[in-house]
């Protein structure tokens, strides 16, 4: 009986992601079989988010309507550790929107989630941000520093990353 | 006071080259990001090539891309455009206009007079 | 491209009254609260003047019977009441995304 109502719950909760998510991977979270974490088919699962990279060209402003619409942000990056792994799935010659803006030209950068803007876990290439004009943040690669970020103007077209929430049922 | 002025129109046949200058005065030419926006004769206004402050950024749509080149010289106060493989359709009005930030956009808030090019064989 | 469709083509106005142009866009050009909508003014001979900024804001030094309005996809700019230095050509533009694209301008004409 606990496991048929505890499955009813999943599948009630599998139906509310279907609209925009028809298939999910899930694992099975510590030793504990009623817990499993799921991302979406075919993210990529990293500590507690789920990523997806969109290949699509698009405007900053657009790209967040984009991941709203899948139930994600832009991307947060918080730690250094969650930025190496996004860039395992990157292309080097391509640059990609975070979730990460300064609308307003002060330099008062914001995360899209309301995260607080920690100067001290920041990833800017040497020299950036440089223009007040560019008011919306990248990441892309560059030969003498790796991978780190760039502000660059909000309604050029750039690929972006998507993050959710792990979905837990 | 913002002064942009254009030059360098003219009539030209088709294939021919041309290039546009416009002289900024009145303002920190290399603060602001820049574009040229035409007119054809008795039409609407379309935007053709836009360069950022830093001169990191050019855009152009299809209809001009591979064959218009926007520049500038900040140390000059001028912005340029040069334009090859001129067709009968690029004849209009050339308007040079400053880019004002605002917050993820931006608008022309200062338009030159404008400078002619006809094509035409 | 972002379409930007302008209603009516041409409107005559008595002087007083009011004159109402809408622009239409084939997609949302606002984002969290800021409405990346923007009104031109052009006079024969002359090049475009920026009226409105934002769907709303007053450019300095144009006369307050100018006024815009809108969010989403819906925007209108009104001059109330209308002068007869008013003829003019009126052009939307929006700029959330590359290409920056203009509606086809609206004519319009004092009686």
């Known amino acids: 009986n606990f496991m048929y109502s505890k499955t009813v719950k999943r599948l009630s909760k599998l139906r509310e992601y279907q609209q925009y998510h028809p298939s999910l991977t899930c694992v099975m979270e510590g030793k504990d079989i009623e817990d499993w974490s799921c991302c979406p088919t075919p993210w990529t699962s990293f500590q507690s988010s789920c990523y997806f990279i969109s290949t699509g060209m698009q405007s900053w402003t657009k790209s967040q309507k984009n991941c709203s619409v899948m139930g994600a942000d832009l991307v947060v990056i918080n730690t250094r550790e969650e930025q190496d792994f996004i860039i395992q799935n990157l292309k080097r010659n391509s640059s990609y929107f975070l979730g990460l803006s300064d609308p307003g030209g002060r330099r008062h950068w914001q995360w899209v989630d309301q995260t607080p803007y920690n100067e001290n876990v920041t990833f800017w290439h040497s020299g950036e941000p440089n223009n007040l004009d560019e008011r919306c943040a990248i990441i892309n690669f560059r030969s003498s520093e790796e991978w780190g970020w760039n502000d660059i103007h909000c309604h050029v077209p750039q690929k972006s990353i998507c993050k959710m929430k792990k979905i837990y049922i | 006071e913002v002064q942009l002025v254009e030059s360098g129109g003219g009539l030209v046949k088709p294939g021919g080259s041309l290039r546009l200058s416009c002289a900024a005065s009145?303002?920190?030419?290399?603060?602001?990001?820049m574009s040229w926006v035409r007119q054809a004769p008795g039409k609407g206004l379309e935007w053709v090539a836009t360069?950022?402050?830093?001169?990191?950024?050019?855009y152009y749509p299809d209809s001009v891309k591979g064959r218009f080149t926007i520049s500038r010289d900040n140390a000059k106060n001028s912005l340029y455009l040069q334009m090859n493989s001129l067709r009968a359709e690029d004849t209009a009005v050339y308007y040079c206009a400053r880019q004002l930030y605002y917050s993820y956009g931006y608008y022309f808030d200062y338009w030159g007079q404008g400078t002619t090019v006809t094509v035409s064989s | 491209d972002i379409v930007l469709t302008q209603s009516p083509a041409s409107l005559a106005v008595s002087p007083g009254q009011r004159a109402t142009i809408t622009c239409r866009a084939s997609e949302s050009v606002s984002f969290h609260g800021t409405h990346l909508m923007h009104w031109y003014q052009q006079k024969p001979g002359q090049p475009p003047k920026l009226l409105i900024y934002?769907?709303?804001n007053l450019e300095s030094g144009v006369p307050a019977r100018f006024s815009g309005s809108g969010s989403g996809t819906d925007f209108t700019l009104t001059i109330n009441p209308v002068e007869a230095e008013d003829t003019a050509n009126y052009y939307c533009q929006q700029s959330i995304e590359d290409p920056p694209t203009f509606g086809g301008g609206t004519k319009v004409e004092i009686k």
């Open positions: 009145g303002f920190t030419f290399s603060s602001y990001g």
């Open positions: 934002a769907a709303s």
């Open positions: 360069i950022s402050s830093g001169d990191s950024y050019t």
